[in-house]
């Protein structure tokens, strides 16, 4: 059974992940970003189901494409280089989903834009956080 300290740690990690994803979304959603229209043509894979921490496997598998698009964004809104930002997210995701069980991610039939993709994972974080508090 999870202890209160492990629950607290999970909550903090989710909050950190949530902030990182929100920062990316704000950075690319900036109305001054002329590249947004072009960036929206990139096809992101969405999870068929995202209700548990193990489903973060689906986010982990999309971090490489996310880094590519962020390199194209070149937004001044990001305090870190895309490579460092994605690396930070990857560390959190690995800790949260754990490495004990190998979960095969199932993707939805429809792809999504980067905005839809980020919103989906932001909602996921918020949902899990709400169950922990």
């Amino acid at each position: 059974a999870p202890t209160s300290s492990s629950t607290k740690k999970t909550q903090l990690q989710l909050e950190h992940l949530l902030l990182d994803l929100q920062m990316i979304l704000n950075g690319i959603n900036n109305y001054k970003n002329p590249k947004l229209t072009r960036m929206l043509t990139f096809k992101f894979y969405m999870p068929k189901k995202a209700t548990e921490l193990k489903h973060l496997q689906c986010l982990e598998e999309e971090l490489k494409p996310l880094e590519e698009v962020l390199n194209l964004a070149q937004s001044k809104n990001f305090h870190l280089r895309p490579r460092d930002l994605i690396s930070n997210i990857n560390v959190i995701v690995l800790e949260l989903k754990g490495s004990e069980t190998t979960f095969m991610c199932e993707y939805a039939d429809e792809t999504a834009t980067i905005v839809e993709f980020l919103n989906r994972w932001i909602t996921f974080c918020q949902s899990i956080i709400s169950t922990l508090t």
Partner: antibody, heavy 117, light 106 residues
Framework: QVQLVQSGAEVKKPGASVKVSCKAS????????MHWVRQAPGQGLEWMGR????????KYAPKFQGRVTMTRDTSTSTVYMELSSLRSEDTAVYYC??????????WGQGTTVTVSS | DIQMTQSPSSLSASVGDRVTITCKAS??????LAWYQQKPGKAPKLLIS???SLETGVPSRFSGSGSGTDYTLTISSLQPEDFATYYC????????FGGGTKLEIK
């Protein structure tokens, strides 16, 4: 695993048309863009255009506009590139490639098209 | 169309050498650049996208840098399997490729 398998070599006469196919496996073509790039003997790479298999939308390089047609058959996970009014300068290896957005991460093995009278 | 000028067009180097290939765009391409490696009789292989993002499985001796109109592919320590032709490709506007750099054994 991801694979793109192209149709075999073609020999055509000037003025004719050629239709090259590219069959995908290991992924859903609707979740990608499919591009066509050609390479004349001893020359560099030349982007011809792309199709979005999800809706059939195409974007062609200005040089090929009006002469190239890209289509797809999602039921067989196959994309096609047809080039009309062939001339000797169209002799090249034609590659299909896939992308999630921009850079092509997987390519077909290439199809040699020879235009000769 | 944006023109991509790649230099040098050919280059002789030895195993272990550090090699740099440059690509200059005729207009700003804002990091929307990829690098490919092609061996004779084979299809190109994607090495780097977004100017700096190394593809999964590509050795870390390959790296990309640059901004605006000027971009660079660096191979920190040449290996025998790296001798090939390298192409840059911009995709800020209608995609165009550089003329290629043939990397040969000295």
């Amino acid at each position: 695993q991801v694979q793109l398998v192209q149709s075999g070599a073609e020999v055509k006469k000037p003025g004719a048309s050629v239709k090259v196919s590219c069959k995908a496996s290991g992924f859903n073509i609707k979740n990608t863009y499919m591009h066509w790039v050609r390479q004349a003997p001893g020359q560099g790479l030349e982007w011809m255009g792309r199709i979005d298999p999800a809706n059939g939308n195409t974007k062609y390089a200005p040089k090929f506009q009006g002469r190239v047609t890209m289509t797809r058959d999602t039921s067989t996970s196959t994309v096609y590139m047809e080039l009309s009014s062939l001339r000797s300068e169209d002799t090249a290896v034609y590659y299909c490639g896939r992308s999630r957005g921009y850079a092509m991460d997987y390519w077909g093995q290439g199809t040699t098209v020879t235009v000769s009278s | 169309d944006i023109q991509m000028t790649q230099s040098p067009s050919s280059l002789s180097a030895s195993v272990g050498d550090r090699v740099t290939i440059t690509c200059k765009a005729s207009d700003h391409i804002n990091n929307w650049l990829a690098w490919y490696q092609q061996k004779p009789g084979k299809a190109p292989k994607l090495l780097i996208s977004g100017a700096t993002s190394l593809e999964t499985g590509v050795p870390s001796r390959f790296s990309g840098s640059g901004s605006g109109t000027d971009y660079t592919l660096t191979i920190s320590s040449l290996q025998p399997e790296d001798f090939a032709t390298y192409y840059c490709q911009q995709y800020w506007s209608t995609p165009t490729f550089g003329g290629g750099t043939k990397l040969e054994i000295k």
